[in-house]
Interface confidence: low
């Protein structure tokens, strides 16, 4: 004879466990049904009646099969420096991640609790280590022979252009200016004569992104005053 399928609630055989999507209720001493994701246990099972499940109420969720009396609260709405990458539904929590130009200064189990703007390296400093989702930009002074003339969270130090004759030597925050001895092509009347470098700049250059117009936001956590990191802007 085939084994009879037990319907919940049922008393498990001694030494055996309840089946998948069931739990053992200590009070009833029975195997009872779990509630599906998006639901919670409204009434616990007894020896004669199974678990009564109910939908999670507004702004709450359960992600797993469960027998919790109340659903978990979704996190608060994403702040202005964040993007909602996963909405709050009855089956999943809201996930907030930092928007472009920001990094996660304080993470939580899923998503980010506190975003901060990526550091901008000021002129004379370039990006040594770019920002990631969870780490800030690291700036470094431009080494001799390189420069950065931008305030940017992405620009690296670039090599000075090489001139036949140098008009103004380059420094950490300015490219070298070349003296043009003989124009390589004729100029239109009234046109400005741009210096012609011998060689084009090396392949290290990166396009400078448009500056983001990020609204200034106050941090959610108290942060004491601290001097800006070397090479970063103090805005």
């Amino acid at each position: 004879l085939p084994a009879q399928v037990a319907f919940t609630p049922y008393a498990p055989e001694p030494g055996s466990t309840c089946r998948l999507r069931e739990y053992y209720d200590q009070t009833a001493q029975m195997c009872c049904s779990k509630c599906s994701p998006g639901q919670h246990a409204k009434v616990f099972c007894t020896k004669t009646s199974d678990t009564v499940c109910d939908s999670c109420e507004d702004s709450t969720y359960t992600q797993l099969w469960n027998w919790v009396p109340e659903c978990l609260s979704c996190g608060s709405r994403c702040s202005s420096d964040q993007v909602e990458t996963q909405a709050c539904t009855r089956e999943q929590n809201r996930i907030c991640t930092c928007r472009p130009g920001w990094y996660c200064a304080l993470s939580k189990q899923e998503g980010c609790r506190l975003c901060a703007p990526l550091r901008k390296c000021r002129p004379g400093f370039g990006v040594a280590r770019p920002g990631t989702e969870t780490s800030d930009v690291v700036c470094k002074p431009c080494a001799p022979g390189t420069f950065s003339n931008t305030t940017s969270s992405t620009d690296i130090c670039r090599p000075h252009q090489i001139c036949n004759v140098v008009a103004i030597p380059g420094n950490a925050s300015m490219d070298a200016v070349c003296t043009s001895t003989s124009p390589t092509r004729s100029m239109a009347p009234g046109a400005v004569h741009l210096p012609q470098p011998v060689s084009t700049r090396s392949q290290h250059t990166q396009p400078t992104p448009e500056p983001s117009t990020a609204p200034s936001t106050s941090f959610l956590l108290p942060m004491g005053p601290s001097p800006p990191a070397e090479g970063s802007t103090g805005d």
């Epitope: 939908s55 109420e57 507004d58 702004s59 109340e70 709405r77 202005s80 709050c88």
Partner: antibody
């Protein structure tokens, strides 16, 4: 889908009064309800709201003065000790907390007059 | 927290004209703002939600804009039926606030 307030009447100051919002075609286990009042010739004033699970939140000025509770088909708002300043039309409205924070469905309102 | 300041308190406009009502939140409510129309003796009627989305059945002459703390309701091609009081309402936080509504703007149509 409709809402209807009831219980509005003339009361003397200090006499507790309960207003009831009866819903039809609305599942109060998925919608929150908000109470708003409007004194004669004045603007809309938020009193508080009750979530589907039964927890209530109040405007800062309304805490301790009002109590909001619910059953499966009604939402009650009790004013514990009315004063003449509580004379107003009282509205209930649905508030979908999965939505955009707007109240789409309003009851017609019930008038409460507090006078000695 | 989240105090809503609405201006002007009253405005007069000719039929066919345009009226602009502004609503300012004391702190950012992102786009969680609704606009309502209320006529004397009637319940408020939802016009616009989520700052700029027209509610069902509302004529396209009503337009909402803004986000963060500054919001605007514009009624263009005003009709006599638009004479009413208009309210803004923040829907971002209903807990521990004084009022979720602006003070209202009375629109008088000449």
């Amino acid at each position: 889908q409709s809402l209807e307030e009831s219980g509005g009447r003339l009361v003397t100051p200090g006499t507790p009064l309960t207003l009831t919002c009866t819903v039809s075609g609305i599942d109060l286990s998925t919608y929150a309800m908000i109470w708003v009042r409007q004194a004669p010739g004045k603007g809309l004033e938020y009193i508080g709201f009750i979530r589907p699970g039964g927890s209530a939140w109040y405007a800062s000025w309304a805490k301790g003065r009002f109590t909001i509770s619910k059953t499966s088909t009604t939402v009650d708002r009790e004013i514990t000790s009315p004063t003449t300043e509580d004379t107003a039309t009282y509205f209930c409205a649905t508030y979908d907390t999965y939505g955009y924070g707007d109240t789409r469905l309003w009851g017609p309102g019930t008038l409460v007059t507090v006078s000695s | 927290a989240y105090d809503m300041t609405q201006t002007p308190a009253s405005v007069e406009v000719a039929v066919g004209g345009t009226v602009t009502i502004k609503c300012q939140a004391s702190e950012s409510i992102f786009s969680y703002l609704a606009w309502y129309q209320q006529k004397p003796g009637q319940r408020p009627k939802l016009l616009i939600y989520y700052a700029s989305t027209l509610a069902s059945g509302v004529p396209s002459r009503f337009k909402g804009s803004g986000s963060g703390t500054q919001f605007t309701l514009t009624i263009s091609g005003v009709e006599c039926a638009d004479a009413a009081t208009y309210y803004c309402q923040q829907g971002y936080d209903f807990s521990a606030v004084d009022n979720v509504f602006g003070g209202g703007t009375e629109v008088v149509v000449k």
